[in-house]
Each structure stands twice: as structure tokens, then as C-alpha cells.
Interface confidence: low
Amino acid sequence: LPAQVAFTPYAPEPGSTCRLREYYDQTAQMCCSKCSPGQHAKVFCTKTSDTVCDSCEDSTYTQLWNWVPECLSCGSRCSSDQVETQACTREQNRICTCRPGWYCALSKQEGCRLCAPLRKCRPGFGVARPGTETSDVVCKPCAPGTFSNTTSSTDICRPHQICNVVAIPGNASMDAVCTSTSPTRSMAPGAVHLPQPVSTRSQHTQPTPEPSTAPSTSFLLPMGPSPPAEGSTGD
């Protein structure tokens, strides 16, 4: 036969605890019902009457089963660099998260306390690791044969265009400039290219000076790596 079910309020057996969604009231010395999320204890239980619950007032909430005398106050309104991703209701606190282009520099239990703009990689640097809700963009210098000519928190380093005839060689912050015939890009593997000038690939050359008006035959000179700290703006 099943054990007899006790209804709240009831005195627990010595050494036993109250059941799920019940609490032990020290004054009444009884197991009493908790209030559901969105409610609070209006009247505490006695030996003969159970907890009386009431709905939370506007701008207050309880998220858990509880026996608190007053609901918690919802957090303040979201700031201009934030968006409200969860409204203040009787059962949940307001949650503010960072708007697009920003990340959370200082988080709180739920949502974000302080948002900061995502780092922008300056020309010559591209995004190595995109920003997330909680982490900033990581920039890296564009490797030889690639460039970025933008100040951006999203642009990666792109390959230089492959020219039939190079007017100005590309560098980390500028695409190659072609002349005469139309260029082809070295995007797809197996792409057919016309013969090109042999690229000089010595490992530790210094950045090339601004090209003169004379055409250059060495159009893939590796750039000396710039320190990553210099690759961003807005710090």
C-alpha cells in the first residue's frame, strides 16, 4: 500500500526534510508550500494554514520557487549600447546584452554590465578571430600576398589580385594594381593564370618603400610583420 500523503502544512518526521517545492518554516515548525515563480509569500504559513502567495508587482519578479516576503526589483533599463533580450516579467529579470558591433567587457550573472565597441583592425591587419558576445576581435597582420585596406571589425585579409601586368605591387594594406589586360584572381584552386613575374620570397626582408612610377617586377615582396598591438584602432 502506498504511504499516506501528507498535505501542507505538516510536521516532518524527525530527521527528515521537506519535499520538493516546500520549505521548513522555523516559526510554525512545519513543512509549508513555496510560492511559484512570479509570486511571493504574502502570508507565511502557520500550524493550521499554508503559505498564502501573491503575484509580484510591476517591475518586480521571482524566478525560483520561494517564500520571500517581497519580489526582487528588476534591473535598470538597458543603456544605449545594449539591447533588451529578455523583458522584465513577474518571473524573470530584465536581461541586457550588447548591441551588434559591441561585446561584453564586464558581464554579470545574466546579461552584461559593461559593453565595449569591438576592436577595428586597421589597414594592413585583418580579423584573425571574430568578436563574440563576450570577447573582442583579434587582429593579425596580413601575410605576404594578402591585404586589408579597411578599418574594420569584420574584414579578413584578402589575397592580392593576380595581374597580367602589375602597375603597382600590392602590400599589406593595398591590393595590387594591374594595368593593360584584365586581372584574374587567385581564388579558386586550379585557376589558370598567365605567366607572372617571379616573386621574391626571401624570408626576412623589410617592408618595401613606396613604389616609384617605374613598374616593379617583384610584386610579392613579403612584408615584415608588424606587431599585432599596432593592428587595431579604438583602444
Epitope: V5, T8, L20, R21, E22, S33, S36, Q39, C53
Partner: antibody
Framework: QSLEESGGGLVKPEGSLTLTCAVS?????????ICWARQAPGKGLEWIAC????????AYYASWAKGRLSISKASSTTVTLQMTSLTAADTATYFC????????????????????WGPGTLVTVSS | IEMTQTPSSVSAAVGGTVTINCQSS??????LAWYQQKPGQPPKLLIY???YLTSGVPSRFSGSRSGTEFTLTISDLECDDAATYYC????????????FGGGTEVVVK
């Protein structure tokens, strides 16, 4: 502990039917919710509605079922599902299932894990 | 909430392993159940809250979650495991239906 559905059978289109779920081995109280689900022949499962086994009478429905299907607690051992304006698309085996609730102010049988099922009753809607 | 279950059918030999996936259209936390249903029988709850086995279910069954993607794995497959398996979002909100996936038939060779 078991559940058993009854009331199924052949019904004409636009007709009505009331299915009954009888519980045994446990009492319908606030510790349980009773839910209905259905399964068309050779098809998947579809949740319909749930009702508090306690005294609150709280019930909630799948969005498609609101208005046409009605769940109610008939007694301490039975829950019914009233169905109106039936169509051929309602042809299915109808199951009742139990969801464990919680002691106290259990507004919802949450989360809804159907841990005890009846064998089902077949409803055929055809002229 | 929509639950997309794949594959619709899978076949494996006795002693093998099968994996069934269920993708939720919304974040349902870990509120997901897996059921086993054999022909002419009601479903049987195997796993609840994404990874917890119900009493009496062998440990050959396991569930996991990664974001909104859930997986049921049956290892050391037995003939008795031949059935249709359903995932179900058990997430309750007043606007969300408790939704079942389309089902996966497991054939044991």
C-alpha cells in the same frame, strides 16, 4: 500504476466524441498532470493537451487543438477529452499519458516528460 | 518549437552502434526527452532532460546535448532495440507546444 483509454471507435465527419482516461494504482492529485497525445496510422506522435490532476483544473493545449478539443478532470480517477467537428485528419490512436508534477504551488506540469502511457484507443473518422 | 529528427531510418548489426539526432528550432535548454515505441504499443520514456536515463533503461542508451542539437546513442545494439525512437521538446511555455520529432526507425540486422 496504469492508464487506460476508452471511448474510441468509428465516427462520422463533423461528429463529436468523448474519450476517457482511467487511472489506476494512483490518485489524480496535484502530483500529476494527465495529458493526451495522438498518433495517426503510420505517423509520428502529436501532443494535444494536459490538465492538472489536482483541484486547480489548470489545462493547456497545443495551439492547433484550442477550441475544438477540450480536456477535463471528470473524477478523481478519470480525465476526458471532448472532441468536436472531427475530420478524417483526426483519425488516430489517442493516448493518455502521465506527467509528474511537484508538491506545492505547481502551476504547470513542467517539464513535460510523459513517463506513463495508456495502450491507446483508436478513433476512426469516416463516412 | 520545431524538432527536426534525423535520420528517418537507420540500420545496424547486433552489437553495433546507432546515433539519432534531434535539432530544436529554439533554445530549449536541456528539456528534451527520448521515447522508444514498438508496433502496437505506446511510447516508453527512455531519457529525460537530454541525458538522464529512466529507471530500468540499460546504460547502452545515452543522450547528450550541444546547444540546440541533441543526440541519442544506442551502443551494443540488441534485437530488442528494434523500434521507432522519438525526441520530444519538454520545454513548457504558454506559447510553445510540446513537440515531438518525426521519429527514427531503428532496424537491427
Amino acid at each position: 500504476q496504469s492508464l487506460e483509454e476508452s471511448g474510441g471507435g468509428l465516427v462520422k465527419p463533423e461528429g463529436s466524441l468523448t474519450l476517457t482516461c482511467a487511472v489506476s494504482g494512483f490518485d489524480l492529485n496535484s502530483y500529476y498532470w494527465i495529458c493526451w497525445a495522438r498518433q495517426a496510422p503510420g505517423k509520428g506522435l502529436e501532443w494535444i493537451a494536459c490538465i492538472d490532476g489536482g483541484s486547480t483544473g489548470s489545462a493547456y493545449y497545443a495551439s492547433w487543438a484550442k477550441g475544438r478539443l477540450s480536456i477535463s478532470k471528470a473524477s478523481s480517477t478519470t480525465v476526458t477529452l471532448q472532441m468536436t467537428s472531427l475530420t478524417a485528419a483526426d483519425t488516430a490512436t489517442y493516448f493518455c499519458a502521465r506527467v509528474q508534477s511537484y508538491v506545492g504551488y505547481a502551476n504547470y506540469g513542467y517539464p513535460n516528460y510523459f513517463n506513463l502511457w495508456g495502450p491507446g484507443t483508436l478513433v476512426t473518422v469516416s463516412s | 518549437i520545431e524538432m527536426t529528427q534525423t535520420p528517418s531510418s537507420v540500420s545496424a548489426a547486433v552489437g553495433g552502434t546507432v546515433t539519432i539526432n534531434c535539432q530544436s528550432s529554439e533554445d530549449i535548454d536541456s528539456y528534451l526527452a527520448w521515447y522508444q515505441q514498438k508496433p502496437g504499443q505506446p511510447p516508453k520514456l527512455l531519457i529525460y532532460h537530454a541525458s538522464y536515463l529512466t529507471s530500468g533503461v540499460p546504460s547502452r542508451f545515452s543522450g547528450s546535448r550541444s546547444g540546440t542539437e541533441f543526440t541519442l546513442t544506442i551502443s551494443d545494439l540488441e534485437c530488442d532495440d528494434a523500434a521507432t525512437y522519438y525526441c520530444q521538446s519538454a520545454y513548457y511555455s504558454s506559447s510553445a507546444d510540446n513537440t515531438f520529432g518525426g521519429g527514427t526507425e531503428v532496424v537491427v540486422k
